[in-house]
């Protein structure tokens, strides 16, 4: 039994790091493998992750981590019974993929404005809370040519769009994702999309 593609991990910088790897042949990941991980820090304990299958030769493990900070470094040992298949390390702060924003809501009762709001996926005491910026994707199923990305570089999870910039009488969808500038993260997954109907009409010119 051998590892074909070494484990690569990403952290949500809150409580979970996800490691994926590929084996040399079909493997029952949960029955045959264990990923042991330990924080390189005084008085820390060794934890065991039971991997799940991710395709025929792929395995995935969700490592539980607490109070993740920049100095954290974990040792990783992949075992098949008594055989050590791979040994490595992982620094969560250097491989961050933020959680996806949630609760995306569209408010159309604001005069002449479409207001989008969503929730920061982190609690205020998390180190990423203050650091997130967002990208909002708006598109129309009625108008396949229309797709826009709005970058939200301020902290407040809101976006205002003049309703007049959207076509009247058609439906639009929006979704949002996040990244953290100071941690040089990848983008989060997109939030679930939300749909609304743009009924705004330009006032008649006198």
């Amino acid at each position: 039994m051998k590892v074909l593609q070494e484990p690569t991990c990403v952290s949500d910088y809150m409580s979970i790091s996800t490691c994926e790897w590929k084996m040399g042949g079909p493997t029952n990941c949960s029955a045959e493998l264990r990923l042991l991980y330990q924080l390189v820090f005084q008085s820390s304990e060794t934890h065991t992750c039971v991997p799940e299958n991710n395709g025929g030769v792929g395995c995935v493990c969700h490592l539980l981590m607490d109070d993740v900070v920049s100095m954290d470094n974990y040792t990783l040992d992949l075992w098949a019974g008594q055989q050590l298949l791979w040994k490595g390390s992982f620094k969560p702060s250097e491989h961050v993929k933020p959680r996806a924003p949630g609760n995306l809501t569209v408010h159309t009762n604001v005069s002449d404005t479409v207001l989008l709001t969503w929730s920061n996926p982190y609690p205020p005491d998390n180190y990423l809370y203050n650091d997130l910026t967002y990208a909002v994707n708006i598109w129309s199923e009625n108008d396949p040519a229309y797709s826009r990305i709005h970058n939200v570089t301020y902290l407040k999870p809101t976006l205002r769009i003049p309703a007049s910039t959207l076509k009247s009488g058609i439906s639009y969808r929006a979704r949002v994702r996040a990244w953290a500038q100071h941690y040089n993260t990848t983008w989060s997954e997109w939030s679930p999309s939300t749909k609304w109907y743009n009924s705004y009409r330009e006032p008649f010119e006198q």
Epitope: F41, D66, D67, S70
Partner: antibody, heavy 116, light 111 residues
């Protein structure tokens, strides 16, 4: 919201021991290390040690090795710091603070006075 | 005796900028991240800066931190009378990190 509530002020005689408590609420108790630090009157902050509430393992500053014991009770989300063989120089305010980076808020502090 | 040295006191007028230095060595600041703590009179310390230059939620951007080699600096702009306090740097040292150390502390007076 997160709170660290410390026990009340203590007056002890030299040679005695003191046990200060720090009760945590508003977060997952076993998810954050807990530090203890102290501050003598008019002096700076001094780190004493740290406990991992998950397993109970500890690390102490060399200066306090052999005199300090940190424990925890997960059923009450409380950590304890016991300092033995007290001397007058141990008169200080003792603080608990959570997380590897001593996040906000800290406990309000417990004044321990050592006097004969 | 702390291995992180800070000036005992600094002072400046309201609206001015002030910096506080924290000098260490390769086994602490040079090999780790620096935090800064503010202690207002009669209160518990509060985390002000972590990871050399990041601010926790609720800390105004008038406070900033930097690190170069074995020294770190806290800068406060637009000084307010409410900023009058003691300031401490702090960092982990040891491999693996096993001990935390605070700086000697600096008293900031707003004139």
């Amino acid at each position: 919201q997160v709170q660290l509530v410390q026990s009340g002020a203590e007056v002890k005689k030299p040679g005695a021991s003191v046990k200060v408590s720090c009760k945590a609420s508003g977060y997952a108790f076993t998810s954050y290390y807990m530090h203890w630090a102290r501050q003598a009157p008019g002096q700076g902050l001094e780190w004493m040690g740290i406990i991992n509430p998950s397993g109970g393992s500890t690390s102490y500053a060399q200066k306090f090795q052999g005199r300090v014991t940190m424990t925890r009770d997960t059923s009450t989300s409380t950590v304890y710091m016991e300092l033995s063989s007290l001397r007058s120089e141990d008169t200080a305010v003792y603080y608990c603070a959570r997380g590897k980076l001593l996040k906000n808020p800290w406990g309000k502090g417990t004044l321990v006075t050592v006097s004969s | 005796q702390s291995v992180l040295t800070q000036p005992p006191s600094v002072s400046a007028a309201p609206g001015q900028k002030v910096t506080i230095s924290c000098s260490g060595g390769s086994s602490n600041i040079g090999n780790s991240y620096v935090s800064w703590y503010q202690q207002l009179p009669g209160t518990a310390p509060k985390l002000l800066i972590y990871d050399n230059n990041k601010r926790p939620s609720g800390i105004p951007d008038r406070f900033s931190g930097s690190k170069s080699g074995t020294s770190a600096t806290l800068a406060i702009t637009g000084l307010q009378t409410g900023d009058e306090a003691d300031y401490y740097c702090g960092t982990w040292f040891g491999t693996p990190a096993s001990n935390y150390v605070f700086g000697t502390g600096t008293k900031l007076t707003v004139l």
